[in-house]
Interface confidence: medium
């Protein structure tokens, strides 16, 4: 790899290994490796191994950091609002005497006007304005599923409030699903949480522009405060570039380990505790794939080069518009270890030890 | 600010401003600023402003990126398991004929053995091993609150499975609360989701080592598979360092804008679209606090300097054990804008535009 001057890859690896030596001791608050004089002979106790495996399983099940943003997330999102179907629509007829829930229906053709293709949708929020209330209530949100069934989406504990407040629910997956189906009326149900042993199943929360009992004055409520969907989507014409232009690659192990990428990428580095650090005191694991980030992130002068080709480079080389972009870790994962303090085995988890992907920042 | 050579702060700002010029156009997929020839005179339409405000409200309500990790998260966590109180304990007596729920009780003195102080707890997971099942069921987890009441914690949709599988619930806040109370028996309830209009409230899920109906063979179930709490905590002796040693500061606007920090920090930069970029085409906002990251992140050679003072520096200057640590954005926020394309006003959201804090990475 070369930037202005040739990079000494071996020196970089050595510096990374030495940094890890300090990092592990520092994370354990140890001034030096613990003495191994009292460590009992033989394998680790079964209970300790089970605990180590439990910790490792947790790590496998959930990555410590959010996934790197997909390419489309770099680009601007057009924001639109879709108001719920008017309360005078016949579709609300059969819902008006239900005390445990209120209903909000949306016409998917209105949604499709704003978001013609399901993958263009970046985020959808259901926004409801809750009126002032003196009671605490646990509420749930459901999605209309088939003719007469509802699918649970989420819940919220609503505490008393002196002023109207907006509630927001992330319904991205639901709206994307609607867009994958045909045009029609789809809806949400906002319900009291009914516990198996609870008696009071009435919804005490009032939502602006809607209410369990149909009122004559609903038509007068200002449209702005009626429940609506806030949609964020990549405009169609911008999305067509995404397919045609060179993709921003995820600078992760899948791509970087199998390519000859000269620019910023994650580089392979396995650390063997014995061989690389001369340590015998970490009993599990024997080593780990630490990896590291390396490669240039060119600064792009945009003043005299305002044309598509140069602008497309921003996404890859300087998405954060830094004055001096730098190749740094993006997704990191923790590392569980087993070591002894005197005769006592310990299982500890070290955060942010494994570099999974890099980015220019 | 100086590193080896003096930094020309004005040049850095200029480069950041120019990078932002390219970044905004690039995010909007524009080769050049849009023509303003057809823009109607007068203020923005009310509906467009309402939409812009809705988007801005969303941004205010939830930061786009996770909060920077607290200092304690840098250090290793000791992992321990606390098994639930044995099913033969009399406390289970009054729960055995309830078909909608199963109960798991824990002795807080066992938990306190592992975590003597509430703030030391980093994470607590309730782990249950679900036996194979051919039914789908929506389940809920509750925390024992006062003598006869239960507080809702979370839910899960369990799909059919051919093999036993572990379920994990994050119960950190609950366990921390228990640690803040006296010693005693505390518990969880694992229940069927009872909808306001549902008839079948029976829990069909079976959990290893526990079951709605008490069985004679429960004692034989291997302890490893009985429900347990997986605890991750900072050991007491390590925590005492946290109070005594120099804290790792959050390199955010609160700290950096009011200090003379020479090392990596977020630096103030307001961009006025008209003055700084010569742009009249962005109608809202008029400008924004872009900010930027600047300052050295010294590499620490740990080979011949294994002593506490140097190790403490890792946390601040090179927590990721990089071969060449770099001052980069940590928390970023989006920016909603209003601009015209021809006669049509558009509200768009640009991701990762405002730098709230920095880190050495």
């Amino acid at each position: 790899l070369s930037t202005c001057k040739t990079i000494d890859m071996e020196l970089v690896k050595r510096k990374r290994i030495e940094a890890i030596r300090g990092q592990i001791l520092s994370k354990l608050r140890l001034a030096s490796p613990p003495s191994q004089g009292e460590v009992p002979p033989g394998p680790l106790p079964e209970a300790v191994l089970a605990l180590y495996n439990s910790t490792r399983d947790r790590v496998a099940g959930e990555s410590a950091d959010p996934e790197p943003e997909p390419e489309a997330d770099y680009y601007a999102k057009e924001v639109t609002r879709v108001l719920m179907v008017d309360r005078n629509n016949a579709i609300y007829e059969k819902t008006k005497d239900i005390s445990h829930s209120i209903y909000m229906f949306f016409n998917t053709s209105d949604i499709r006007e704003a978001v013609p293709e399901p993958p263009l949708l970046s985020r959808a929020e259901l926004r409801l304005q809750r009126l002032k209330s003196s009671v605490e209530q646990h509420v749930e949100l459901y999605q209309k599923y088939s003719n007469n069934s509802w699918r649970y989406l989420g819940n919220r504990l609503l505490t008393p409030t002196d002023t109207p407040e907006w509630l927001s629910f992330d319904v991205t997956a639901v709206v994307r699903q609607w867009l994958n189906q045909g045009d029609g009326i789809q809806g949400f149900r906002f319900s009291a949480h009914c516990s198996c042993d609870s008696k009071d199943n009435k919804l005490h929360v009032e939502i602006n522009g809607i209410s369990p009992k149909r009122r004559g004055d609903l038509g007068t409520i200002h449209d702005m405060n009626r429940p609506f969907l806030l949609l964020m989507a990549t405009p169609l014409e911008r999305a067509q570039h995404l397919h045609s232009s060179r993709h921003r690659r995820a600078l992760d192990t899948n791509y970087c380990f199998s390519s000859t990428e000269k620019n910023c990428c994650v580089r392979q580095l396995y650390i063997d505790f014995r061989k690389d650090l001369g340590w015998k005191w970490i009993h599990e694991p024997k080593g780990y794939h630490a990896n590291f980030c390396l490669g240039p992130c060119p600064y792009i002068w945009s003043l005299d080069t305002q044309y598509s080709k140069v602008l497309a480079l921003y996404n890859q080389h300087n998405p954060g518009a830094s004055a001096s972009p730098c190749c740094v870790p993006q997704a990191l994962e923790p590392l569980p270890i087993v070591y002894y303090v005197g005769r006592k085995p310990k299982v500890e988890q070290l955060s942010n030890m494994i570099v999974r992907s890099c980015k220019c920042s | 600010l100086s590193t080896c050579k003096t930094i020309d702060m004005e040049l850095v700002k200029r480069k950041r401003i120019e990078a932002i010029r390219g970044q905004i156009l690039s995010k909007l997929r524009l080769a050049s600023p849009p023509s303003q020839g057809e823009v109607p005179p007068g203020p923005l339409p009310e509906a467009v402003l309402a939409l812009y405000n809705s988007t801005r409200d969303r941004v205010a309500g939830e930061s786009a990126d996770p909060e920077p990790e607290p200092e304690a998260d840098y250090y290793a966590k000791e992992v321990t398991r606390v098994l639930m109180v044995d099913r033969n304990n009399a406390i289970y007596e009054k729960t055995k004929d309830i078909s909608h729920s199963i109960y798991m009780f824990f002795n807080t003195s066992d938990i306190r053995e592992a975590v003597p102080e509430p703030p030391l707890l980093s994470r607590a997971e309730l782990r249950l091993q679900r036996l194979k099942s051919s039914v789908e069921q929506h389940v809920e987890l509750y925390q024992k609150y006062s003598n006869n009441s239960w507080r809702y914690l979370g839910n899960r949709l369990l799909t059919p499975t051919d093999t036993p599988e572990w379920l994990s619930f994050d119960v950190t806040a609950v366990v921390r609360q228990w640690l803040n109370q006296g010693d005693g028996i505390q518990g969880f309830r694992f229940s069927a989701h009872c909808s306001c209009d549902s008839k079948d409230n029976k829990l069909h899920v079976e959990i290893n080592g526990i079951s709605p109906k008490r069985r004679g063979d429960l004692g034989t179930i291997h302890d490893m598979n009985r429900p347990f709490l997986l605890l991750m905590a900072t050991p007491l002796e390590r925590a005492q360092h946290l109070h005594s040693s120099r804290h790792r500061r959050a390199l955010d606007t609160n700290y950096c804008f009011s200090s003379t920090e020479k090392n990596c920090c977020v630096r103030q930069l307001y961009i006025d679209f008209r003055k700084d970029l010569g742009w009249k085409w962005i109608h809202e906002p008029k400008g924004y606090h872009a900010n930027f990251c600047l300052g050295p992140c010294p590499y620490i050679w740990s080979l011949d300097t294994q002593y506490s003072k140097v190790l403490a520096l890792y946390n601040q200057h090179n927590p990721g054990a990089s071969a060449s640590p770099c001052c980069v954005p940590q928390a970023l926020e989006p920016l909603p804008i209003v601009y015209y394309v021809g006669r049509k006003p558009k509200v768009e959201q640009l991701s990762n535009m405002i730098v709230r804090s920095c880190k050495c990475s």
Epitope: N107, S109, P116, G182 | -
Partner: antibody, heavy 120, light 111 residues
Framework: LQLVESGGGLVQPGGSLRLSCAAS????????MAWVRQAPGKGLEWVSA????????YYANSVKGRVTMSRDNAKNTLYLQMNSLKSEDTAVYYC??????????????WGKGTLVTVSS | QSVLTQLSSMSGSPGQTVTITCTGS?????????LSWYQQLPGTAPKLLIY???NRASGVPNRFSGSKTGSLASLTITGLQAEDEADYYC???????????FGGGTKLTVL
């Protein structure tokens, strides 16, 4: 605005056919599209629809699994690939522009149609 | 058998008013889904008359109007003319099928 179908003709049962529809006079890449057929002397039957970018397609139960609808926005062309044809697929096939972008909410412009005859 | 039911034929004299009906169910018309009406003159392709239940397509004379009550939709033609002799189809999205459906069609004869 113009929609011109082509590719119809005589085909044996079990055979395949690919219909095309050339679109002009509107922004094809922003429009949902549909195919509708009409058997001789019978009523209209909706066959399939596609969204503007082609990421979602919808089919009538009578053709599901035998028919694939696709589009090439660069060429402003819509396609209907028909396999395992049966005699009951004999009809005039119309290409139509969707009222909204799914093609499932009605059609506002129609082509003149192309005749497909399935017979041995 | 169509999901949307129409009378197979109707007739009327010039100048008269005729109403063509289309009966559906809660999974289509009654579900609040947009209904369209199409006219097909003999030997030609269908043409959109009405969309979204009661909106006239461009170029359609105001003699044509649409309405809906519950699951019943209607197309009304006032001041019937000879050139209105055609087949008329209703069409709507059906959520139980996740498809678009047409009525069987009504053949209107102008006497």
């Amino acid at each position: 605005l113009q929609l011109v179908e082509s590719g119809g003709g005589l085909v044996q049962p079990g055979g395949s056919l690919r219909l095309s529809c050339a679109a002009s006079g509107f922004t094809f890449s922003r429009s949902g599209m549909a195919w509708v057929r009409q058997a001789p002397g019978k009523g209209l039957e909706w066959v399939s629809a596609i969204t503007p970018g082609g990421t979602a397609t919808y089919y009538a139960n009578s053709v599901k699994g035998r028919v694939t609808m696709s589009r090439d926005n660069a060429k402003n062309t819509l396609y209907l690939q028909m396999n395992s044809l049966k005699s009951e697929d004999t009809a005039v096939y119309y290409c139509a522009k969707g009222l909204v972008s799914s093609g499932l909410n009605g059609m506002d412009y129609w082509g003149k149609g192309t005749l497909v005859t399935v017979s041995s | 058998q169509s999901v949307l039911t129409q009378l197979s034929s109707m007739s009327g004299s010039p100048g008269q008013t005729v109403t063509i009906t289309c009966t559906g169910s809660s999974s289509n018309i009654g579900g609040g889904y947009y209904l369209s009406w199409y006219q097909q003159l003999p030997g030609t392709a269908p043409k959109l008359l009405i969309y979204n239940t009661n909106n006239r397509a461009s170029g359609v004379p105001n003699r044509f109007s649409g309405s809906k009550t519950g699951s019943l939709a209607s197309l009304t033609i006032t001041g019937l003319q000879a050139e209105d002799e055609a087949d008329y189809y209703c069409g709507c999205y059906d959520d139980s099928l996740n498809t678009y459906v047409f009525g069987g069609g009504t053949k209107l004869t102008v006497l």
